[in-house]
C-alpha cells in the first residue's frame, strides 16, 4: 500500500542533493587551504541530521548546531559584504575583489546556495516532490531556518565597516522582511561595527536619481542609527562600470576623461 505523502506548496529537494552537497564541500576545501581540515563526510552527516526524520515545519536553529560547529570559519570581519535581492552582482563583486566575502563565499553558504531540501517526519527519506513554502506553509522549514542561522552568525561576526548591496530597481530598496532586514541588520554588533555602508545599485542607464534619499533607505538609516551604528549610502549608477573599475582601478574609465 503506497504511503500517504504530505504535499507542500514549494518545490521539492533539489535532485542529487546529497551528491551536490558532498561535491561542493570537497571542491571548497580543495580551493580554500584554511578549510582543508574539514571532513566532508562528517559535514554531510551533520547537514542530513539537521532535517532527516524531522517534520519539515518544526526545524530549529538547534538542529543545525552540529553543522555550524563543523563549518566554523574565520573570515576577515572587516571585509564582509551583505546583499539583499541582488545576489548575482554581489557575487560578481567578490569574485573580482577577492579580499571581500559574501555569505556564499563561506563554506556553509557555498554548500547550500540555490538548493532546496526537506525530509519527512519519522522516515529517513528526502522529499524530492515538495517542500514547505515560507509563506504558504511554514517559516520553520529546513531551508529558511538554515539561512536564518548562517545569516545571523555571519552578521554577528562582522566588524568595522560593513557593506550591503541593495537593489535600487525594487519598490522596496530596503525591505524589513528580507533576510538582511529581518536578521542581519539586527545582529550587527554595535560594539564591533562602526559603520554600515549601503550601496544602492541602479538598474536604468539614465537613472540619475539619488536613491539614497529613498524612504526605505531612510528607514534603514533610522534602524541602524538607533543601534548606535553609523550609516553611509552610495549610489552605484552604472554597475558594469563599477565592476570594471574594481578590476582595473588605474583605468581612466574610473574617472572623467581629462
Amino acid at each position: 500500500v503506497p504511503r500517504w505523502r504530505q504535499q507542500w506548496s514549494g518545490p521539492g529537494t533539489t535532485k542529487r542533493f546529497p551528491e551536490t552537497v558532498l561535491a561542493r564541500c570537497v571542491k571548497y576545501t580543495e580551493i580554500h587551504p584554511e578549510m582543508r581540515h574539514v571532513d566532508c563526510q562528517s559535514v554531510w552527516d551533520a547537514f542530513k541530521g539537521a532535517f532527516i526524520s524531522k517534520h519539515p515545519c518544526n526545524i530549529t536553529e538547534e538542529d543545525y548546531q552540529p553543522l555550524m560547529k563543523l563549518g566554523t570559519q574565520t573570515v576577515p570581519c572587516n571585509k564582509i559584504l551583505l546583499w539583499s535581492r541582488i545576489k548575482d552582482l554581489a557575487h560578481q563583486f567578490t569574485q573580482v575583489q577577492r579580499d571581500m566575502f559574501t555569505l556564499e563565499d563561506t563554506l556553509l553558504g557555498y554548500l547550500a546556495d540555490d538548493l532546496t531540501w526537506c525530509g519527512e517526519f519519522n522516515t529517513s527519506k528526502i522529499n524530492y516532490q515538495s517542500c514547505p513554502d515560507w509563506r504558504k506553509d511554514c517559516s520553520n522549514n529546513p531551508v529558511s531556518v538554515f539561512w536564518k542561522t548562517v545569516s545571523r552568525r555571519f552578521a554577528e561576526a562582522a566588524c568595522d565597516v560593513v557593506h550591503v548591496m541593495l537593489n535600487g530597481s525594487r519598490s522596496k530598496i530596503f525591505d524589513k522582511n528580507s533576510t538582511f532586514g529581518s536578521v542581519e541588520v539586527h545582529n550587527l554588533q554595535p560594539e564591533k561595527v562602526q559603520t554600515l555602508e549601503a550601496w544602492v545599485i541602479h538598474g536604468g542607464r539614465e537613472d540619475s536619481r539619488d536613491l539614497c534619499q529613498d524612504p526605505t533607505i531612510k528607514e534603514l538609516e533610522s534602524i541602524i542609527s538607533k543601534r548606535n551604528i553609523q550609516f553611509s549610502c552610495k549610489n552605484i549608477y552604472r554597475p558594469d562600470k563599477f565592476l570594471q573599475c574594481v578590476k582595473n582601478p588605474e583605468d581612466s574609465s574610473c574617472t572623467s576623461e581629462i
Partner: nanobody, 117 residues
Framework: QVKLQESGGGLVQPGGSLRLSCVAS????????MGWYRQAPGKQREFVAR???????GYADSVKGRFTISRDNTKNTVYLEMNSLKPEDTAVYYC???????????WGQGTQVTVSS
C-alpha cells in the same frame, strides 16, 4: 554638487614624506571613487592613485611602492601617504572624486608639493 578640499602640501627634501588629505562635502552619495592626480609645470595632468568603495586601490607605475592611498568612510576623506619623495614628484596635486559612467566628476583646487634640497 560636491566640494573637495585638499591639504597637506608643502616643501620637503628628497627622500622625505608628506601626507595629503582631501575632504569631500555636499552630495557625497554620488561619489564612489576618490583619487589623486598631479600636474607638473609645463606637463599634462597625470593619474597618481585611486581608491574605490570596498577598498580596491590603483596606482601609477611611477609611485607604486612609495605612495599609499586610503580612505576614511566616517570623515569622507581620502589620504595620500607619500614616502621616498623625489624631485620629479614636484607638482600640484589635485583630488578627484566621481562615479564611473556618469557625469558626476569633481576636482579640488589643488595643493602644491615641492621636493627640493
Amino acid at each position: 554638487q560636491v566640494k573637495l578640499q585638499e591639504s597637506g602640501g608643502g616643501l620637503v627634501q628628497p627622500g622625505g614624506s608628506l601626507r595629503l588629505s582631501c575632504v569631500a562635502s555636499g552630495s557625497i552619495s554620488s561619489i564612489i571613487t576618490m583619487g589623486w592626480y598631479r600636474q607638473a609645470p609645463g606637463k599634462q595632468r597625470e593619474f597618481v592613485a585611486r581608491v574605490i568603495i570596498g577598498g580596491s586601490t590603483g596606482y601609477a607605475d611611477s609611485v607604486k611602492g612609495r605612495f599609499t592611498i586610503s580612505r576614511d568612510n566616517t570623515k569622507n576623506t581620502v589620504y595620500l601617504e607619500m614616502n621616498s619623495l623625489k624631485p620629479e614628484d614636484t607638482a600640484v596635486y589635485y583630488c578627484n572624486a566621481g562615479n564611473p559612467g556618469t557625469s558626476y566628476h569633481y576636482w579640488g583646487q589643488g595643493t602644491q608639493v615641492t621636493v627640493s634640497s
